[in-house]
């Protein structure tokens, strides 16, 4: 009765358990009772990343600059090329097949997390006491100016989009306050 299973680094062919080819090599010929599996290294710009019985190596991924892509890590005979996006852009998927511009946070919103090559900007609404008056992919919400520390008073209240406006203290009220 021929074998129905093989060990993990083997494959079943013609009632034989043949050795798989190591990562970085492709199958040229199956083993026989008297000859070992024959494997050959992948060519330039090709790879195989597992123990395998593939007769063709895979082509390295091309990081197309027209899609905003650049090489993050050059491929080897055992690994694929890893692409990332140009500065200011991020990948549209985990496979990073194309890029989109980082999103900006509108006025009233600040950057919670700056975008990376693989994740977009994360914005958050500016809470009470903070504001953002610009559309930006980098600016956080800024705290309102503290008029008191400048010995000024609030002349106009702040919003999530505007800072408070400080002005001088009322001299008369100030005078009465001290007498």
């Amino acid at each position: 009765e021929p074998p129905t299973a093989c060990r993990e680094k083997q494959y079943l062919i013609n009632s034989q358990c043949c050795s798989l080819c190591q990562p970085g090599q492709k199958l040229v010929s199956d083993c026989t009772e008297f000859t070992e599996t024959e494997c050959l290294p992948c060519g330039e710009s090709e790879f195989l990343d597992t123990w395998n019985r593939e007769t063709h190596c895979h082509q390295h991924k091309y990081c197309d600059p027209n899609l905003g892509l650049r090489v993050q890590q050059k491929g080897t005979s055992e690994t694929d090329t890893i692409c990332t996006c140009e500065e200011g852009w991020h990948c549209t998927s985990e496979a990073c097949e194309s890029c989109v511009l980082h999103r900006s946070c509108s006025p009233g919103f600040g950057v919670k997390q700056i975008a990376t090559g693989v994740s977009d900007t994360i914005c958050e609404p500016c809470p009470v006491g903070f504001f953002s008056n610009v559309s930006s992919a980098f600016e956080k919400c800024h705290p309102w100016t503290s008029c008191e520390t400048k010995d000024l008073v609030v002349q106009q209240a702040g919003t999530n989009k505007t800072d408070v406006v400080c002005g001088p203290q009322d001299r008369l009220r100030h005078h009465h306050h001290h007498h």
Epitope: A5, R7, T37
Partner: antibody, heavy 127, light 107 residues
């Protein structure tokens, strides 16, 4: 230290059942294929069963097929051999053994061997 | 199933002797063969894998050769600790099988 320790052996009546365990330590158990090998008193070695690292693939000697089941719990570093419908001829010392794949990237395809063995547990099937 | 036949079944030799044990397979197994040493009351110990590769820590007086169907284990100069039983095993395909063993005794 890399170690395998079998337990669960003992005296059992013909037709009875027994579950052997093999506790692994000192290595990443879940990365290795494992085997059970037995040795009847005064006799040679007999391969009994094989299990892949994930437990997905198993194989058995014809003499135990349909009666013995090999399994593993990688979270507990344990290998098992469930033995049912035991016969007198199953009397033996049972060893668990680690399969290792030796590989030299510059050489020919790699080779297997059983590089770590437990001390064995005795199973006696007798009425 | 693949049968392995070891010869001789037993062998008497002296310290310093060169000893050869053979293992013949019923079908070609390329170099998918291992050799083990076993002493009474102990588990087997791996000596050779892939027909000719020496396991780490095994003395260089042990060597293996062969491919296909015919294999040999050679001990170039027997030491007192080498008196034991030796087994070949094919790991080419399931079911894995062992030779019947060669008992090496002191003269």
């Amino acid at each position: 230290e890399v170690q395998l320790l079998e337990s669960g052996g003992g005296l059992v009546r013909p037709g009875g059942s027994l579950r052997l365990s093999c506790a692994a330590s000192g290595f990443t158990f879940g990365s290795y294929e494992m085997n059970w090998v037995r040795q009847a008193p005064g006799k040679g070695l007999e391969w009994v069963s094989y299990i892949s690292s994930s437990g997905e693939t198993t194989d058995y000697a014809d003499s135990v097929k349909g009666r013995f089941t090999v399994s593993r719990d990688n979270s507990k570093n344990l290998l098992y051999l469930q033995m049912n419908s035991l016969r007198a001829e199953d009397t033996a010392v049972y060893y668990c053994a680690r399969d290792v794949f030796f590989f030299d990237s510059s050489g020919p395809p790699g080779a297997y061997g059983m590089d770590v063995w437990g001390q064995g547990t005795m199973v006696t099937v007798s009425s | 199933d693949i049968q392995l036949t070891q010869s001789p079944s037993s062998l008497t030799a002296s310290v310093g002797d060169r000893v050869t044990i053979t293992c013949r397979s019923s079908q070609g197994i390329r170099s998918s063969l291992a050799w083990y040493q076993q002493k009474p009351g102990k588990p087997p110990k791996l000596l050779i894998y892939g027909a000719s590769s020496l396991e780490g820590g095994v003395p260089s007086r042990f060597s293996g050769s062969g491919s296909g169907t015919d294999f040999t284990l050679t001990i170039s100069s027997l030491q007192p600790e080498d008196f034991a039983t030796y087994y070949c095993q094919q790991l080419n395909s399931f079911p894995s099988t062992f030779g019947q063993g060669t008992k090496l005794e002191i003269k």
